[in-house]
Each structure stands twice: as C-alpha cells, then as structure tokens.
C-alpha cells in the first residue's frame, strides 16, 4: 500500500549501472483474460552478450516455486521456453534488452499473488539478480458469459444442442426448452479452466431452449430455436 | 503515522535465551520485507536478519546463524528475534526496520538495548 | 567477507561542503543507501539508490556512486549535520553491509 512509502525527489542524476529491477506494486486483471507483467532491469556488466536465463517464480522471491523459465544461448536473442506452468506462461520481453515482462494467459483465481522476476549472467560474468518485491497480481472474479451455443446434428436423425459459458467462479449450467423434464437432460461438460460447456443430447420437440449459467456474480442467458422441416402429407 | 516499537531486550547470562518483539503500526506490515540491525556500544550498525513477506524467505549475518532466528505475525503486525546461545560480543542496541521498495531502509525503531553479562 | 569502507572522522566548517566516501566491491553491483544517526537517536535514511533523497530530508543532501566508491555530500553544512554517517549496500548473496561510519565534526 502506498500510503506507507516514503515519497523522493532526486538528489543527483549520475546514471550508474547496478543491479535493480523496476516492477510495479500492482497488475489487476478479470478472470478469463491475461496479463502482463511487467519487469526491467538494470546491471553493472557493460555489453554482456554471454548465455543468460530469465525466471519468474510466485508466491516467494528466492524460493518460491518457477512458473516460467527460459535460456538464452550465447549472442541469441531468442530465449528458449524451459518451463510454462500449465503452459500459460510466455516472456513478452527481451531479456537481452533488459526486459523480463511476463505474459499470462487465461487467468483464474488462484493465480491471484505476487511474482517475482529474476535473471541469471551464467557465462564469464556469473552474477544473478532477482527482485525482492515482486509485483501483485490480482486477479478479480468474473461474471458468467455465454460464448457460444448451437444445435448440432445427433444419432438417428436427432438433434443435440451445446452451450459453452465462462466465468469465474466457473458458472453452472442449466438447459430448459419445451419438453417436460429436460432441464435435467443437461450434461455437464469438461470444464476448460474457466469454461464450462453443458449440452442437451436429445431435442425431442420444436421450440425454444434456453441455456442459463449463473455464479455468484450473477447469470446470463441465451436460446437457440430448433423448427424441423415437415414434408406435406 | 508509520512506526516500529521495539520490546524484549534486557540484561541476560552468556548461553541464556531472550526473544524480541517489534510492533508496526501506519502501514500494511505484511506487504514489506523485515530486518533487524545491531549496534553494540559505542560501534557502528551491523546488518543481523531479514524475514520476507510470509516469513518463508530468511537471512542471517554469518555472526548470528545457527543461533537467532526471526519470524514475524502478520496477523500480528510484529516482527520476531528469537536469540539463543548469547554471548558477550552479542551485546547491543537491537533495531527493527522496514525495507522499503528499493535498497534501504527506510523505517526505524527506537532500539532496545540486550545485555549479555555475567 | 563483504566489506565497505568509510573514513572514521570528517570535519568540515559550517557552510562549507562535506563529501563522505565509502567503498567496496558491492558498490560495483549494487546501489548504495546512507543513514545518519545522532547520538542516543534511531538512523535515518538520508539517500537510497546512490543518488535519491527521500521526502523530508533537505536539499544539500546528495550521493553519487562512481565504480566501487560512493560518496554522500552535504553542501552548506549545518550545525544540526554533525553526526555519524553510515554507507550501506546489498551484496551478492543477498546479504546487507553497512560501512564502519564516519563521524562528521562540524567546526565552530
């Protein structure tokens, strides 16, 4: 919290090289979406073109678990992806510019915390530095949105109808058209992260269904019609 | 306002225990890192300990490892050193401070003062 | 070890400028921070990363960090200046010194 920082000014503009990293307090993003984090540094090792590693890690500077490593061979400008937890993670940066920023993709909950970037010189200059206080993700909960629905062909001439949601909390999915009772037909799908799909195996009338998900943030809701072509007698 | 309040300290025999308590208030304890700094009489300030956020994340003075260890509450807003196997030359005014968001510290106690005599 | 060297005393005449060094390897790597403490009194941090000056802390305070040795500058120094100066930095392996200290006499 900023209210306990101590304000600056400068006291004299000599641009020495050291060690630093510049992150901010705070990235805040929805559910679902991504985000970057951003990470600059500085160092004292003038024109270092040897084989470096960028890292970020959660939870804890220095020992908290790695969601995202990568090396980079000497003179390359390329960092070759080692590791990318759930493979979500992906270095916007360059780190041979000075630049760790760290993309995340498909955000949930749960990666609500702080991460902390760190880089590692392993050739002649054999330094590391990482930051101390990290930047603060967090990420804030997202209502349901229903993102696709269809009427699909199904066995034996019959229809089925699907409707995929997302959300988080993952909302849950209810179908109701004009059949007594197939509400409960509903088959909750494979939920994808923060998407649920539910789908309705048999559409035994003409009409309309309707596909709600809803979580504690609220609901949303859409239809699909469903009129069969019946030939003349 | 911002402010670190030292307590604990006190005479106490060589080999014996004391355990130091530092309360914060003015700011959100748990989102800085933590140290405690030394200063025996009439010497200069010697770096003792750092404690992380969550208190996972520990560093210790090659003078006092094996034999202190700090901890912090956050619930709490207090910070923690447990000192064991005292000895004379352990003798001095113990600060907490706060780390600010760059290389320093920016926030200091007032000290209290541990004497290690026989 | 890591170590930072400071002169132990400095003198100065009042309005006169003070200049306080302070080396060691670290300095190389590492921004340096400076505290002032007067007797009986907690430090105070007067300049971070070399060069900066937090809020409160007058303007003829500044620092500067050139290879392995960095410097603390009081321009016009003040009666209320006389002190002990203290340098610090980090070090590699995440560690912190802080320099022996250097007591400032103002003159007069």
């Known amino acids: 919290d900023a209210s306990g920082d101590l304000l600056n000014t400068e006291a004299h503009s000599a641009p020495a090289q050291r060690w630093s990293m510049q992150v901010p307090a705070e990235v805040n993003a929805e559910a679902g979406d991504a985000a970057v984090l951003p990470c600059t540094f500085t160092h004292p090792h003038r024109h270092y073109d040897g084989p470096l590693t960028a890292i970020w890690r959660s939870g804890e500077p220095y020992a908290g678990p790695q969601v995202f490593r990568c090396t980079a061979a000497p003179g390359s400008e390329l960092c070759q992806t080692a590791l990318s937890l759930h493979g979500r993670f992906r270095l916007l940066g360059n780190p041979r510019r000075n630049d760790l920023s760290l993309r995340v993709e498909r955000l949930a909950l749960a990666d609500s915390g702080r991460y902390f970037c760190r880089v590692e010189f392993t050739g002649d200059a054999h330094d590391r530095y990482e930051s101390r206080h990290g930047v603060r993700l967090r990420v804030t909960a997202a209502a349901p949105r229903i993102v696709n629905i269809s009427v699909l062909p199904g066995p034996a001439h019959a229809f089925r109808a699907l409707c995929t949601a997302e959300g988080e909390p993952p909302p849950a999915l209810a179908w109701s058209g004009p059949a007594p009772g197939n509400s409960s037909a509903a088959l909750q799908g494979q939920g994808h992260g923060y998407q649920v799909t539910a789908e309705l195996p048999a559409l035994t009338r003409d009409g309309r269904y309707t596909c709600t998900a809803a979580n504690s943030l609220g609901r949303a809701e859409a239809s699909v019609y469903l009129f069969r072509f019946h030939g003349a007698p | 306002q911002v402010q670190l309040v030292e307590s604990g300290g006190g005479l106490v025999q060589p080999g014996g225990s004391l355990r130091l308590s530092c309360a914060a208030s003015g700011f959100t304890f748990s989102n800085y890192w933590m140290t405690w700094v030394r200063q025996a009489p009439g010497k200069g300030l010697e770096w003792v300990s750092f404690i992380s956020y969550s208190g996972s994340t520990t560093y210790y003075a090659d003078s006092v490892k094996g034999r202190f260890t700090i901890s912090r509450d956050n619930s709490k807003n207090t910070l923690y050193l447990q000192m064991n196997s005292l000895r004379a030359e352990d003798t001095a005014v113990y600060y907490c401070a706060r780390e600010g968001t760059s290389s320093m510290f920016d926030v200091w106690g007032q000290g209290t003062l541990v004497t290690v005599s026989s | 070890d890591i170590e930072l060297t400071q002169p132990p005393s400095v003198s100065v005449a009042p309005g006169q400028t003070a200049r306080i060094s302070c080396s060691g390897d670290?300095?190389?790597?590492?921004?340096a921070s400076w505290y002032q403490q007067k007797p009986g009194q907690a430090p105070v941090l007067v300049i971070y990363?070399?060069?900066k000056r937090p809020s409160g802390i007058p303007e003829r305070f500044s620092g500067s960090n050139s290879g392995n040795t960095a410097t603390l500058t009081i321009s016009g120094t003040q009666a209320e200046d006389e002190a002990d100066y203290y340098c610090?930095?980090?070090?590699?392996?995440?560690?912190?010194?802080f320099g022996g200290g250097t007591k400032l006499t103002v003159l007069g």
């Open positions: 990363d070399d060069n």
């Open positions: 610090a930095s980090f070090t590699y392996m995440s560690d912190f010194v």
């Open positions: 670290a300095l190389r790597s590492y921004y």
